[in-house]
Amino acid sequence: SQHVFQAKVSEDVAIGTKVGNVTAKDPEGLDISYSLRGDTRGWLKIDHVTGEIFSVAPLDREAGSPYRVQVVATEVGGSSLSSVSEFHLILMDVNDNPPRLAKDYTGLFFCHPLSAPGSLIFEATDDDQHLFRGPHFTFSLGSGSLQNDWEVSKINGTHARLSTRHTEFEEREYVVLIRINDGGRPPLEGIVSLPVTFCSCVEGSCFRPAGHQTGIPTVGM
């Protein structure tokens, strides 16, 4: 069976960082030349003489970890025999992905006219690892100019409620900017747009001749 070499590095290591090394011995004592096979992402290079492996591009844990490549050790001169071993690079997570909405929220609506202030619920996510606990996002409006019309309140670490502050909205679409902060190290913030439509309703759904809208909000506080 193939020998497996393993190394562990942070996904944000600088380009040119040594991330591991592979060594082989030739029974006849001949020199060995090392090469990589299967470096599909073009992240690594190997020193042909020493077997040291270096990063040559930004690494990304979210693209897949561990990153598996093969190292080919070939004897120099003689019969040029070679052997293949595995090199597994385990990438440790860095908080490098800002929060985003967990799904497409283009169908959010309120029935117009509002009879009472209404609210709806949305969810955030990101692509980083959350060890020992789930994500702990905080939510706030993206502009103070929205404060007269909207209020955002946290429900839990991933969900928040967007509420209207009054009932005077017109029958049209409003775009509400929301800031989502992941509280990580370093903290990352995403600004997302929630399009909210106020529309005439038929049987609790937005009446649109062209198609059906999903997502029924709660009405009332």
Epitope: S140, S145, Q147, N148, D149, H166, E168, E170
Partner: antibody, heavy 115, light 108 residues
Framework: QVQLVQSGAEVKKPGASVKVSCKAS????????MHWVKQAPGQRLEWIGE????????NYNQKFKGKATLTVDKSASTAYMELSSLRSEDTAVYYC????????WGQGTTVTVSS | EIVLTQSPDFQSVTPKEKVTITCSVS???????LHWYQQKPDQSPKLLIK???NLASGVPSRFSGSGSGTDFTLTINSLEAEDAATYYC?????????FGQGTRLEIK
């Protein structure tokens, strides 16, 4: 009741900087964004930007990026606007205002830039 | 940015007259995002009407507002001497927030 009290008039030389303060009282300072507005002589009101006192996140009018810097001191319930590289066209009255409720403005701070 | 254009720039009127100031918006906005302010010399702007038609606290009922989309109006019925001021419309639909150029009312 809400009160926004601004620092006094300033006279500055071209190229200098000035920092205008806005002391808030009568409400929880971190709850509402603070806005800043410029009124040059004979000109319309111009929105400079806004800052969320809870975490100092700010939005700026593109026209004032690099000119104005908005900050807050939560412990003192005070918002600040610093204007850098002053020129004669920065001569104006500057207001802090709470856009929440639309109605609360500071008394204004006159900044005069003159050599 | 959204541009607000007021008309007229200046008006000289006699007491008890009816005054109409218009505010034309460069792109359609919701009526909840259009507000009117009054400013007297050496004073801060004072909120007059919020969300197109809602009178601010303490504002006399002779002031009223209307409109939708791109055309909004401030009306003063039976003008009084104390109404001499500059009036501004303002939109809060998009950043940057923008104001009209102002309409100065003079009492004859």
């Amino acid at each position: 009741q809400v009160q926004l009290v601004q620092s006094g008039a300033e006279v500055k030389k071209p190229g200098a900087s000035v920092k205008v303060s806005c002391k808030a009282s009568g409400y929880t300072f971190t709850t509402y964004w603070m806005h800043w507005v410029k009124q040059a002589p004979g000109q319309r009101l111009e929105w400079i930007g806004e800052i969320d006192p809870s975490d100092s996140y700010a939005n700026y009018n593109q026209k004032f990026k690099g000119k104005a810097t908005l900050t807050v001191d939560k412990s003192a319930s005070t918002a600040y606007m610093e204007l850098s590289s002053l020129r004669s066209e920065d001569t104006a009255v500057y207001y802090c205002a709470l856009y929440y409720g639309y109605g609360d403005w500071g008394q204004g701070t006159t900044v005069t830039v003159s050599s | 940015e959204i541009v607000l254009t007021q008309s007229p720039d200046f008006q000289s009127v006699t007491p008890k007259e009816k005054v109409t100031i218009t505010c034309s918006v460069s792109s359609s906005i919701s009526s909840i995002h259009l507000h009117w302010y009054q400013q007297k010399p050496d004073q801060s702007p004072k909120l007059l009407i919020k969300r197109t038609s809602n009178l601010a606290s303490g504002v006399p009922s002779r002031f009223s507002g209307s409109g939708s989309g791109t055309d909004f109006t401030l009306t003063i019925n039976s003008l009084e001497a104390e109404d001499a001021a500059t009036y501004y419309c303002q939109q809060g639909s998009n950043l940057p927030l923008t104001f009209g150029q102002g309409t100065r009312l003079e009492i004859k």
